[in-house]
Amino acid sequence: ELCDDDPPEIPHATFKAMAYKEGTMLNCECKRGFRRIKSGSLYMLCTGNSSHSSWDNQCQCTSSATRNTTKQVTPQPEEQKERKTTEMQSPMQPVDQASLPGHCREPPPWENEATERIYHFVVGQMVYYQCVQGYRALHRGPAESVCKMTHGKTRWTQPQLICTGEMETSQFPGEEKPQASPEGRPESETSCLVTTTDFQIQTEMAATMETSIFTTEYQ
């Protein structure tokens, strides 16, 4: 099931999904001056089964002036460089995304795509946070967030990460006390069913990732 909203925003941090759960959608969006080709797809969808998943449909953009161009070329390096994503461009790719059953890899760029990718995640998706360049992480717990289904509604767990400037003290003015659990309350307080599909495999993946993602200085 689709998560109703996006993962939480952490000041001075970005998040990335290392792989996208089957059912994830990616909007087909184009950068300024370009639009989707006529009869072009509105979104890409990660489809498949537990053994093999792939992105269905392709996003294609064309110049607003010439609506009938349909060429799809891999962007030049300078075009790729300008694209901003809500994911972390980590110096190393810590996990072989293909090794996760029921998940899709990061879709390759398409020509003239928008500067920001907008994904719509599904229940069970896990994303990982990293402080942006110039900030360092203060961990109070896992720097990750999971989309869960609780009481028939979706919500993202709260990542336990604070990003502080190198020159600053670790205590922010007005900083809240550390929370008891990633969700902001002990799990025992809630008695209803929590859907935790794929948590085991993603937690194992996170364990193998933690050293490479979060101890590598972001250059």
């Epitope: 959608m25 909007n27 969006e29 009869s39 797809s41 509105l42 489809t47 907008i118 719509h120």
Partner: antibody, heavy 115, light 107 residues
Amino acid sequence: DVQLQESGAELAKPGASVKMSCKASGYTFTRFWMHWVKQRPGQGLEWIGYINPSTDYTEYNQKFKDKATLTADKSSSTAYMQLSSLTSEDSAVYYCARGTVVDYWGQGATVTVSS
Amino acid sequence: DIQMTQTTSSLSASLGDRVTISCRASQDISNYLNWYQQKSDGTVKLLIYYTSRLHSGVPSRFSGSGSGTDYSLTISNLEQEDIATYFCQQGNTLPPTFGGGTKLEMK
């Protein structure tokens, strides 16, 4: 909870314009497209267009290109649709609806065009 | 534009019945087919997207199937609250287009 609250019913004269609003709450407004859909009494649904509130990028159904103008105000998480040069054909219920697969809809706003 | 056709404009059924509503596209829409429910008060809800994916909060008695140009919505065990009009919609390409609707009534 995701909610889309549309402005109230409008009564307008032929040739006039109306601007209706759709106030979004319960989600990050800029991360979801906002669509507008028309439904004439006793008839089906017609897609008018959508706006990406993050970039103000719009796409319109060719049929409504000269009729509707979509805008969004990020600061108030509100989407707007202006209908111009109204005729009796524009009398309908108009819905705002969010998302890539259009997953949540407003309650609908009735526009009546009459002299 | 892609035309969406719901050949049955109204359908009568009894509580507990299994009801199937069909929808046909004028060209292949690659499973990008959504189903909506509209109640008599005008409220519209997404039931199913991408042919068979249940939207959150939708009862499991609703299911969808199909491929290519032919799609269907099935209500396995009709309940009173299911009395409504059902629309299919293709979300593959712009402009998204809707079927004419199938009004479900109680016998």
